[in-house]
């Protein structure tokens, strides 16, 4: 019972991860304009990793795609590359995890080929949330790079008398909401691990145990002599615990994602 | 089509109030920001605030903070502008303006004329 | 507050003759979001409210003749009367989109030569 729920729960996680990561992914708001600097701006700009956007104090929006693969910076293309890995990794994932999860009967499919199907897609969801995580990262390294660069050359006079305000970026909440996710994934995917052992099929149902001769000693270790001995694996990988009995009281709830303009 | 219609010409004594109303029709009300405008006898025009209908956000200029305030009614798809404390330079022709892209203000009321005298 | 200076302040023209008006802001107006200068050009001609002419510097609004023109960038723009007509007397104002408060110029005045 324990398993199947660690097992449910880190599939639920991580759908929930994977839906924040693709979440983060097609967000615009990865950059936004810093208003420290300039509070009273009445045109504000965001970016994104596959378009800029500028909202007016009108309330008009205008956003326009980076047409260009070759002119973006690498990095950029980096973190493109690093949440589309991340999420085709999390799909994958999902996908293996759902016929792996316990509550889900599946023709004659044996706990051994479910326990590994836990574990792979349990690294999946690993390597997904540490993908997410890294490109978030990158991002944000690169934001705080460019915005000490602008700092320091913040105002660049014409004779001291007009100013041009060099417009800064910040962290956007694309950044958090792909943090959050990735760890969500990640977390998730743990999760899946642990279900994994437990599902995986003991060597042994039962300890060694020692059989003593009346002449002289001889220690036996189930798994020896399996014909002689009937104590070795069993080879149905049947689970003495299971009972057979498989109850799919589980609801799994998938989120719905809104967007808000 | 689109057209803004404000009150009529106001006289008030100084330190008194005035509200004056722009009436939008012609479009969506919420869907366009209503900013106001004065225009005082030989000066340039001076931007005074404006409401998101929408919501209801409004922002000011700081020279007319805590003394002007700007509100709206979506049923009568109406916005109003009340100035407090009035002096005798605030004689002048006050508009409201409909706000499109750029921030600009394509279509304007045709103005109301605030006369402050004692 | 950015302070709009407008120059001259007043301009006699001959009817078909090139009008040119200058606008100058104390800071760029040029947003590096999407390239567009945030500043509007306006016609106001006696006891009626300004008339838009251009948005983002050099957009002319729908319905505004062809021979006005709006150009300029950063701190500097110019707004061109190709051939003044009679109905072209007014006076013109700038306008900072870019920045609250919104500033106006001071305005000038076009008059027929």
């Known amino acids: 019972m324990a398993v199947t729920a660690c097992q449910g729960l880190g599939f639920v996680v991580s759908l929930i991860g994977i839906a924040g990561i693709i979440a983060a992914t097609c967000m615009d708001q990865w950059s936004t304009q810093d208003l420290y600097n300039n509070p009273v701006t009445a045109v504000f700009n965001y970016q994104g990793l596959w378009r800029s956007c500028v909202r007016e104090s009108s309330g008009f929006t205008e956003c326009r795609g980076y047409f260009t693969l070759l002119g973006l910076p690498a990095m950029l293309q980096a973190v493109r590359a690093l949440m589309i890995v991340g999420i085709v990794l999390g799909a994958i994932g999902l996908l293996v995890s759902i016929f792996a999860l316990k509550c889900i009967r599946i023709g004659s499919m044996e706990d051994s080929a479910k326990a590994n199907m836990t574990l792979t897609s349990g690294i999946m969801f690993i390597v997904s949330g540490l993908c997410a995580i890294a490109g978030v990262s990158v991002f944000a390294n690169m934001l705080v790079t460019n915005f000490w660069m602008s700092t320091a050359n913040m105002y660049t006079g014409m004779g001291g008398m007009v100013q041009t305000v060099q417009t800064r970026y910040t962290f956007g909440a694309a950044l958090f909401v792909g943090w959050v996710a990735g760890g969500l994934t990640l977390i998730g995917g743990v999760m899946m691990c642990i279900a994994c052992r437990g599902l995986a099929p003991e060597e042994t149902n039962y300890k060694a145990v020692s059989y003593h001769a009346s002449g002289h000693s001889v220690a036996y270790k189930p798994g020896g002599f399996k014909a002689s001995t009937g104590f070795g694996s069993n080879t149905k990988n049947k689970k003495i615990y299971d009972g057979g009995a498989r109850t799919e009281d589980e609801v799994q709830s998938y989120p719905s994602k809104h967007d808000y303009v | 089509q689109v057209q803004l219609v404000q009150s009529g010409a106001e006289v008030k004594k100084p330190g008194a109030s005035v509200k004056v109303s722009c009436k939008a029709s012609?479009?969506?009300?919420?869907?366009?920001?209503i900013q106001w405008v004065r225009q005082a006898p030989g000066q340039r025009l001076e931007w005074m605030g404006y409401i998101n209908p929408y919501n209801d956000d409004t922002k000011y200029n700081e020279k007319f903070k805590g003394r002007v305030t700007i509100t709206r009614d979506t049923s009568a798809s109406t916005a109003y502008m009340e100035l407090s404390s009035l002096r005798s330079e605030d004689m002048a022709v006050y508009y409201c303006a409909r706000t499109y892209y750029g921030n600009s203000f394509p279509n304007w009321g045709q103005g109301t004329l605030v006369t402050v005298s004692s | 507050d950015i302070v709009m200076t407008q120059s001259p302040d007043s301009l006699a023209v001959s009817l078909g003759e090139r009008a040119t008006i200058n606008c100058k802001s104390s800071q760029s107006l040029l947003n590096s979001g999407n390239q567009k200068n945030y500043l509007t050009w306006y016609q106001q001609k006696p006891g009626q409210p300004p008339k838009l002419l251009i948005y983002?510097?050099?957009t002319r609004e729908s319905g505004v003749p062809d021979r006005f023109s709006g150009s300029g960038s950063g701190t500097d723009f110019t707004l061109t009367i190709s051939s003044l007509q009679a109905e072209d007397v007014a006076v013109y104002y700038c306008q900072n989109d870019y920045s609250f408060p919104f500033t106006f110029g001071g305005g000038t005045k076009v008059e027929i030569k």
């Open positions: 983002w510097a050099s």
């Open positions: 012609g479009y969506t009300f919420t869907k366009y920001i």
